[in-house]
């Protein structure tokens, strides 16, 4: 976990606070050069097993829209362009982290949280049971 | 932007600070009941377009461990094993909020950041380019 | 210094087509912000036509009334949003703002531009 | 679509006045309710969002207050410069997002 600073220039902490709550700067340093995965690849519409983007808003929530990736078949797509059901289209899925507003009708107060989403999909072999 | 809030029971900030600066509770709230790419699922190496998750640890950002995923091979795995080299095996990436402690060395003061990661790969049909 | 800059606007006929421009300057198009056409018709109220996420993904919310004869779109390289108007008709006639919704807050708009007379007149 | 219903459509105050003005939702918003200052042949300026949070730059005459559908905003000692409309705005997600105003209030010196 994170402890009580000591350091000299630091922003200090009340001890009954630390280590819950930080100061974050919201001046965002982005290190990509592009931010766009629709626009930097169309792989949605050309993998095998393709995905369609669905918006999921939440305005107590940064960042507020995440998009979700939705497998378009249960199997892959061959080079035909027919779903092969022997394989399986499935999504690829990312723990991410995300500001809740916290208490809720506090603009500058937020509490970190964690959710899964879906990136995107892959084909995988699908794993066969066998019944005895 | 963001500005000081008025609202009574929130954390107040000052103007000079303020709209880059808002406090965060790191007590994280977790939506999710997995949180290790690797154990919850093995489709990293089911897949037709398989890769290797690498460790991308730093100290100084939370979190400090992000893996990175490497497919690992320019081409698809077909059904017989062999690789398939008309399709490629392509990153899916994704931008995440980390955060970046700054100054450097404060353990209660950081920087909101956008990183760009590759969390799986999928299998795409080649873009060919004709020339005339 | 940050500011939207609209063009475009002018006088066309009922039944014609038009398209407006903004200009963003001092911030650049990013997952981080929507883009959005909000308009006025002399002493009359704002109305809000429309937004379009300026990263990410291809995707626009309309009002209602607005959805089929108005289309917004986006070239990222300028920098720049449009607002592509067909079917004009008198009831058009009004000053057209853009205004930039800040990801960070997606519940009000924190820039708008100074606005382009768009007059519907034979 | 949630309609915005503001009053009074005009209001006629003195500098020193004391003057509210309220935003009424067709259903709840929560919090989600911002207003705006504007002024003849300018764009609008945002004066408060979440209901009540204060806009950068802004003079701490102007408050606002109320959530779920009906809301107010308080200038509470009227200044030469605080004659001009005010609207009210609204956000509201369901399958897409959308915005509304209000009618504005017009406010005139008496």
């Known amino acids: 976990g994170i402890a009580i600073p000591r350091n000299s220039g630091c922003p200090n902490s009340e001890d009954k606070n630390f280590p819950r709550t930080v100061m974050v700067n919201l001046n965002i340093h982005n290190r990509n050069t592009s931010t766009n995965p629709k626009r930097s690849s169309d792989y949605y519409n050309r993998s095998t097993s393709p995905w369609n983007l669905h918006r999921n808003e939440d305005p107590e929530r940064y960042p507020s829209v995440i998009w979700e990736a939705k497998c378009r078949h249960l199997g892959c797509v061959k080079a035909d362009g027919n779903v092969d059901y022997h394989m399986n289209s499935v999504p690829i899925q990312q723990e991410i982290l995300v500001l809740r507003r916290e208490p809720r009708h506090c603009p500058n107060s937020f509490r970190l949280e964690k959710i899964l989403v879906s990136v995107g999909c892959t084909c995988v072999t699908p794993i066969v049971h066998h019944v005895a | 932007g963001i500005a000081i809030p008025r609202n009574s029971g929130c954390p107040n900030s000052e103007d000079k600070n303020f709209p880059r600066t808002v406090m965060v509770n790191l007590n994280i709230h977790n939506r999710n009941t997995s949180t290790n790419p690797k154990r919850s699922s093995d489709y990293y190496n089911r897949s037709t377009s398989p890769w290797n998750l690498h460790r991308n640890e730093d100290p100084e950002r939370y979190p400090s461990v992000i893996w990175e995923a490497k497919c690992r091979h320019l081409g698809c795995v077909k059904a017989d094993g062999n690789v398939d080299y008309h399709m490629n095996s392509v990153p899916i990436q994704q931008e995440i909020l980390v955060l970046r402690r700054e100054p450097r060395h404060c353990p209660n003061s950081f920087r909101l950041e956008k990183i760009l990661v590759s969390v799986g790969c999928t299998c795409v049909t080649p873009i060919v380019h004709h020339v005339a | 210094e940050v500011q939207l800059v609209e063009s475009g606007g002018g006088l066309v006929q009922p039944g014609g087509s038009l398209r407006l421009s903004c200009a963003a300057s001092?911030?650049?198009?990013?997952?981080?912000?929507?883009m959005c056409w909000v308009r006025q018709a002399p002493g009359k109220g704002l109305e809000w036509i429309g937004c379009i996420y300026a990263g990410d993904v291809d995707d626009t919310d309309y009002a209602s009334w607005a959805r089929g004869r108005f289309t917004i779109s986006r070239d990222n390289s300028k920098n720049t949003v449009y607002l592509q108007m067909n079917s004009l008709r008198a009831e058009d006639t009004a000053v057209y703002y853009c205004?930039?919704?800040?990801?960070?807050?997606?519940?009000?708009?924190?820039?708008w531009g100074q606005g382009t007379l768009v007059t519907v007149s034979s | 679509d949630i309609q915005m219903t503001q009053s009074p459509s005009s209001l006629s105050a003195s500098v020193g006045d004391r003057v509210t003005i309220t935003c009424q939702a067709s259903?709840?918003?929560?919090?989600?309710l911002a207003w705006y200052q504007q002024k003849p042949g300018k764009a609008p300026k945002l004066l408060i969002y979440r209901a009540s949070t204060l806009a950068s730059g802004v003079p701490s005459r102007f408050s606002g207050s109320g959530s779920g559908t009906d809301f107010t905003l308080t200038i509470s000692s009227l200044q030469p410069e605080d004659f001009a409309t005010y609207y009210c705005q609204n956000y509201y997600y369901s399958t897409s997002r959308s915005y509304g105003f209000g009618g504005g209030t017009k406010l005139t010196v008496l």
């Open positions: 205004a930039r919704v800040d990801g960070f807050d997606i519940t009000y708009f924190d820039l």
């Open positions: 001092g911030f650049s198009f990013s997952s981080d912000y929507w």
């Open positions: 259903q709840t918003i929560n919090y989600w």
